[in-house]
């Protein structure tokens, strides 16, 4: 309705004597700003005067405020939106209707708000979930329809009158929609909390009691049980009787069924609170408990361990491990069912009693072949002695023993010979199934344990064999002592250390890596010509003409070996320089003349310099100097200089003659 003023605020506000009221309020006037505001208590419209009568708690006009209860009642609003009010302190006789009389330039409005002030602080209200189950977290809510900025309060939770340890979360609301204070407590109740009283206590800022609300907890839980047994230690002998009783200490709701379990499995036809076991057997030993159910679920008692005692049963022997490896450790375990556990054991090896062995386990730290055989045992407890079982067999395994490699050939062995070797051994468990040879090669094994090396290599120094069952036993290596011609013959320059320059003293060494036998002879050759018979070849002053391909030979009684050809390179400064001319030393003007600087040098010339007949430097660096077009005045003697890393060399003068062309002669 566009003819109404629009207000928003809580419909009713609650407080008590001496507290305060905070009234959150918003409005929208029909036109313009608020010009006059009066707060009435229980206003009544007077038709005669066309005005409202009633107690004026607050007044604000264009002319200014009229003092009444202005200190107690405060208008905290403004001229267009906010109409929030505060009454502090609030009294019992403030209960009733508050009337907000609003006037703008052309419009008027009366807005009514209910105020409920009680004599004493009213109690909060506890809200519980519809059902509470043990160990399931629930939220307890305590709600109070009150909140005021000028009157701080607190809500505290108590269980059976004792403050609760859990942290509560308190929230307040002071909005146009609602005014309240709320405390929420998260809580995981146990079955023992069933029937206990929970209190939410309203306190002032100093912790002084104002009011409270209480509820009794109804905690649904499975039955809680106690089990009793006769005899109390639950230890009996075969043939004795046992009684177990189940007692319910708490159940919510009431229990519905009873059952008994042994080792987690339900016992058939046992549905009463008493379990009677007559003439028990050893099979009835185990863990017993009773189970009682209600609508929440089953509850179980603690377990009772019933022990039925009996003499040892026939024993068996377990070996860790068989077959056993020689040198390893072995453990024998005597296994016999008995209650109480056996206190004494007697051990037998191949039917003969083992002295001093009375424990459940026998440990042999280092097994030897003679430990093999049958092991058995007898167990004994307070109720009697058991029987000796069938026993267990220990197999002791070991690698082949005393392995040797034997050379079948006559000595000495030469490179290229065929060598036969055999692999022998003394004893083995299990049997030898294969042989290995070191080093590995593409060798023939004509029969088990025999090796044939065709065309034996110079470097076949030693051979070893292994006889293998589950393990391999290696023999000591045998030396073949193969004889061969000198190997890896090569020429090595020992002087100078750097590159060879013309005029240097040069020494070449003939090296080889090995020879057997060691006695050797040397030969040097260049281009098929014998030069010397020493291990070194020496040049006092090397010349470029000594450059070439050198080889050396080394022989012993087995044969002779040559080196790879070694190139001797002699470095020298450019020499034999000359200037050649193309197309010739006589050229017609206007044509092209190319001067080439020819030389012999090692390394080759890296840099050329050109000069004319007056030794003036020409701006060229390459081997060729090109004059195009050539002129008559270019006639003259030219020379070049060649440079390499060793030094410089210069050519003699070469004369270029440039003659006039027919055209020039014709013009003269």
């Amino acid at each position: 309705d566009s003819s109404k003023w629009v207000f928003e605020h809580p419909e009713t506000l609650y407080a008590w004597e001496g507290a305060c009221v905070w009234i959150p309020c918003t409005y929208r006037a029909l036109d313009g700003d608020l010009e006059s505001f009066i707060l009435f208590h229980n206003p009544e419209y007077n038709k005669n005067t066309s005005k409202f009568d009633g107690t004026r708690l607050y007044e604000s006009t264009k002319d200014g405020k009229v003092p009444s209860e202005q200190k107690r009642v405060q208008f905290l609003g403004d001229k267009n939106k906010n109409c929030t009010l505060s009454i502090h302190p609030v009294h019992l006789n403030d209960s009733g209707q508050l009337g907000l009389r609003m006037e703008s330039k052309t419009e008027k409005w009366m807005e009514r708000i209910h105020l409920n002030v009680s004599e004493r602080p009213f109690p909060p209200h506890i809200q519980l979930p519809p059902e509470i189950q043990e160990s399931q977290e629930v939220t307890l809510t305590c709600l109070l329809n009150f909140s005021c900025y000028g009157y701080p309060i607190q809500l505290q939770w108590l269980l059976e009158g004792v403050p609760m340890r859990q942290a509560a979360v308190t929230s307040t609301s002071l909005t146009i929609k609602s005014v309240f204070t709320r405390s929420e407590l998260k809580f995981s109740p146990q079955w023992s909390h069933h029937g206990k009283i929970v209190t939410c206590q309203l306190q002032d800022a100093d912790g002084k009691f104002l009011s409270n609300d209480t509820v009794q907890l109804n905690v649904k839980h499975t039955p809680k049980l106690e089990i009793k047994v006769t005899p109390s230690d639950a230890i009996v002998r075969e043939g004795d009787s046992v009684t177990m009783t189940c007692e319910v200490s708490s159940s919510n709701p009431e229990y519905t069924t009873v059952s008994w379990l042994k080792d987690g499995t339900s016992l058939k036809k046992q549905n009463t609170f008493t379990l009677n076991l007559r003439e028990v057997t050893k099979d009835q030993s185990g863990k017993y408990c009773c189970q009682v159910s209600n609508d929440v679920g089953p509850g179980r008692s603690e377990e009772v361990f019933l022990q039925v005692q009996y003499a040892p049963e026939p024993s068996t022997v377990q070996i860790l491990h068989s077959p056993a490896v020689e040198g390893s450790q072995v453990e024998f375990l005597c296994m016999s069912l008995a209650n109480p556990l056996p206190t004494n054991y007697t051990w037998y090896h191949n039917g003969k009693e083992m002295q001093g062995r009375t424990e459940e386990k026998v440990h042999i730290p280092k097994i030897l072949p003679w430990h093999a055989g049958t092991y058995s045992c007898v167990a004994e407890n307070i109720l009697g002695t058991g029987q000796r079982g069938p026993g267990a067999e220990l197999d002791v395994q070991y690698p082949p023993k005393k392995v040797t490699t034997v050379i079948q050939n006559p000595m000495p062995i030469r490179e290229g010979d065929t060598v036969t070797l055999s692999c022998n051994y003394n004893s083995s468990n299990p049997s030898v199934t294969r042989y290995e040879w070191k080093p590995h090669g593409a060798w023939e094994e004509p029969s088990l344990g025999v090796l044939k090396i065709q065309n034996v290599g110079w470097d076949n120094t030693t051979i070893a064999c292994a006889a293998c069952n589950s393990w391999c036993s290696w023999a000591s290596p045998v030396a073949l002592n193969v004889q061969y011609a000198p190997r890896d013959v090569r020429v090595r320059k020992i002087k100078p250390l750097s590159e060879i320059h013309s005029g240097n003293s040069v020494s070449l060494q003939c090296d080889f890596s090995s020879s057997h036998p060691k006695e050797v002879q040397f030969f040097w050759e260049k281009n098929g010509r014998l030069l010397g018979k020493e291990s070194q070849l020496n040049f006092d002053s090397i010349s470029p003409e000594d450059a070439g391909s050198y080889s050396c030979w080394v022989n012993n009684s087995i044969g002779q070996t040559a080196s790879k050809a070694w190139t001797l390179e002699v470095l020298y400064a450019p020499r034999r320089l000359r200037v050649s001319m193309s197309p010739g030393d006589q050229v017609m003007e206007g044509k092209s003349a190319t001067l080439t600087c020819e030389s012999d040098a090692n390394p080759p010339v890296s840099h050329y310099t050109w000069f004319d007949w007056n030794n003036q430097s020409l701006p060229y660096h390459s081997q060729k100097l090109r004059l195009e077009p050539v002129k008559v005045q270019h006639s003259g003697a030219y020379w070049c200089q060649g440079t390499n890393s060793v030094g410089k060399g210069r050519s003699p003068l070469s004369t270029l003659t440039v003659y006039y062309s027919p055209e020039t002669i014709g013009r003269r």
Epitope: H607, T609, F611, D612, W613, N614, Q616, S617, L618, P619, Y620, H621, S622, Q623, K624, R626, L627, K631, Q633, H634, G636, Q641
Partner: antibody, heavy 125, light 111 residues
Framework: EVQLQQSGPGLVKPSQTLSLTCAIS??????????WNWIRQSPSRGLEWLGR?????????DYASSVRGRVSINVDTSKNQYSLQLNAVTPEDTGAYYC?????????????????WGQGTMVTV | QSALTQPASVSGSPGQSITISCTGT?????????VSWYQQHPGKAPKLMIY???NRPSGVSNRFSGSKSGNTASLTISGLQAEDEADYYC???????????FGTGTQLTVL
Amino acid sequence: EVQLQQSGPGLVKPSQTLSLTCAISGDSVLSNSDTWNWIRQSPSRGLEWLGRTYHRSTWYDDYASSVRGRVSINVDTSKNQYSLQLNAVTPEDTGAYYCARDRLQDGNSWSDAFDVWGQGTMVTV
Amino acid sequence: QSALTQPASVSGSPGQSITISCTGTSSDVGGYNYVSWYQQHPGKAPKLMIYDVSNRPSGVSNRFSGSKSGNTASLTISGLQAEDEADYYCSSYTSSSTPYVFGTGTQLTVL
């Protein structure tokens, strides 16, 4: 301080001859430790050496193979200057033309580096 | 005669170092130690910065250095400054019928 001052027209018609002059101050065109060069620059061809002249016991000149046959470099010793003549020009010859000196660095060693340059002449064909 | 190959552009921040490469053949860069480097600002003539691979003319900052390996020469500018922004050209003596060859040029930008 050696300076090279260039002169010559900035606009030449196709098929005509381009003539540029380079006046030397602070050095002599007759120096036997210098070469006197012409270099041009265009966006399409970049920097391009065209030719040089130098005096030793007599006068020598060299030309780039790309212009050989239509180029000549002449010297006027009295004015201490050298010039470039490029015949039968085409729009391809458009660019900035520079004269430059190359100097013998020590004794007989040429650095082949242009240590002094003219201000350049922009020639449009 | 083909021009020597240079990267079209290189950039660096003030204070940084940059290197410009110049690749030729065994007939030019690889065959002779006559590589030179030039700096050219827009509208100006080239200026010699390095000659004979690694020599600096007097008046050129020691921030500029040159080197050569095989057929490739390099110009390194250390402690880059705003005024170094320019085009850079390499040049080499060559044994072909034209004795000099220049590089394609590299534009240096100082960020």
